[in-house]
Interface confidence: low
């Protein structure tokens, strides 16, 4: 399994964001596919589990991301995106997404860097 | 060996309709999606819509109204169809595979047919 | 809609030479951009995917690099069977899958 992401991503505060991730594998997509998403935050700290996904979509039922993430994925197209509502500024940190596709071998974990920025003022 | 081969009318008249089979080798239509994509005299290239591995379809929404896509696994061909055909829909139409990559790119390509709108 | 833009339409070169195609999407496309090689009777390739991976079979004189919305196409060494036309494509936010203009690759 192969993974892609956009790297890094900046987002403004209050906002909403789609967290993108999508795969290779040689192996076809069914059901044993599992995806992981966790976050660390910048500032340090233990890795927090953000969601899961294995044959349906599981959203936390507690901590910070609950009812504030949702499944924005197509496995069918090798797509296993979030979409994580409300930005707060401590949600800045790394995003990381792991995919396994049995019987294909794990690869690396895709990373993104979310950086949330105040709102632009507008200026004339 | 992974091909594609595309088979159609050559020649339409204006209103009808145009129907194009890409019949593939090489891989499976149960794993693999299949794009379709057209070149018009002297342009670029245009997607046009896309069946997947589990027969859901994508559209370009300019031709939502007028394209179909569809297939049969079992006999590894794409059929597209396309209503209401106009002079501006002469082009080259291809079918194109979707790659085993993240980057939805389109890894091998048909030869493309040759579609004239004409009376 | 995502629209890419190839400035050059065409562009002239030697054999031998390295050459540079340009390619700009309206948006940030997250390295999400393929590059397509078109022959003169039509045939079609993949060359580089997700911005700079080579796709299997392609030499390595192709090479891709970029960010955000602005990505290259470059050939070092060129031959005879690369004069063709490039299109890039965007596969970002989809559907549509969106391509560039092309830049027509000719001999000198």
């Known amino acids: 399994v192969e993974i892609y992401t956009s790297g890094a991503l900046e987002a403004v505060n209050g906002t909403d964001v789609r967290l993108k991730c999508t795969f290779s594998s040689f192996a076809p997509v069914g059901d044993a596919l599992t995806v992981t998403w966790n976050f660390r935050p910048r500032d340090g700290g233990r890795e927090q589990f953000v969601f899961y996904y294995h044959m349906d979509p599981f959203r936390p039922m507690s901590g910070r991301f609950k009812d504030r993430v949702v499944w924005d994925g197509n496995p069918e197209r090798y797509d296993v995106s979030i979409l994580l509502w409300k930005l707060q500024f401590d949600d800045n940190g790394t995003y990381t997404c792991q995919v396994k596709n049995p019987p294909d071998v794990d690869g690396l974990v895709g990373t993104i860097r979310l950086s949330v920025v105040h709102t632009v003022p507008f200026s004339e | 060996e992974v091909q594609l081969k595309e088979s159609g009318p050559g020649l339409v008249q204006p209103s009808q309709s145009l129907s194009i089979t890409c019949t593939v080798s090489?891989?499976?239509?149960?794993?693999?999606?299949v794009h379709w994509v057209r070149q018009s005299p002297g342009k670029g290239l245009e997607w046009l819509g896309v069946i997947w591995s589990g027969g859901s379809t994508d559209y370009n929404a300019a031709f939502i109204s007028r394209l179909s896509i569809s297939k049969d696994n079992s006999k590894s061909q794409v059929f597209f169809k396309m209503n209401s055909l106009q002079a501006n829909d002469t082009a080259i139409y291809y079918c194109?595979?979707?790659?085993?990559?993240?980057?939805?790119?389109?890894?091998?390509w048909g030869q493309g047919t040759s579609v004239t709108v004409s009376s | 809609d995502i629209q890419m833009t190839q400035t050059t339409s065409s562009l002239s070169a030697s054999l031998g030479d390295r050459v540079t195609i340009s390619c700009r999407a309206s948006q940030d496309i997250s390295n999400y951009l393929n590059w397509y090689q078109q022959k003169p009777d039509g045939t079609v390739k993949l060359l580089i995917y997700y911005t700079s991976r080579l796709h299997s079979g392609v030499p390595s004189r192709f090479s891709g690099s970029g960010s955000r919305i602005d990505y290259s196409l470059t050939i070092s060494n060129l031959e005879q069977e690369d004069f063709a036309t490039y299109f890039c494509q965007q596969s970002d936010t989809l559907p549509p899958w969106t391509f560039g203009g092309g830049t027509k690759l000719e001999i000198k």
């Open positions: 090489g891989f499976s239509l149960t794993r693999y999606g």
């Open positions: 194109a595979r979707n790659g085993y990559d993240g980057g939805y790119a389109m890894d091998y």
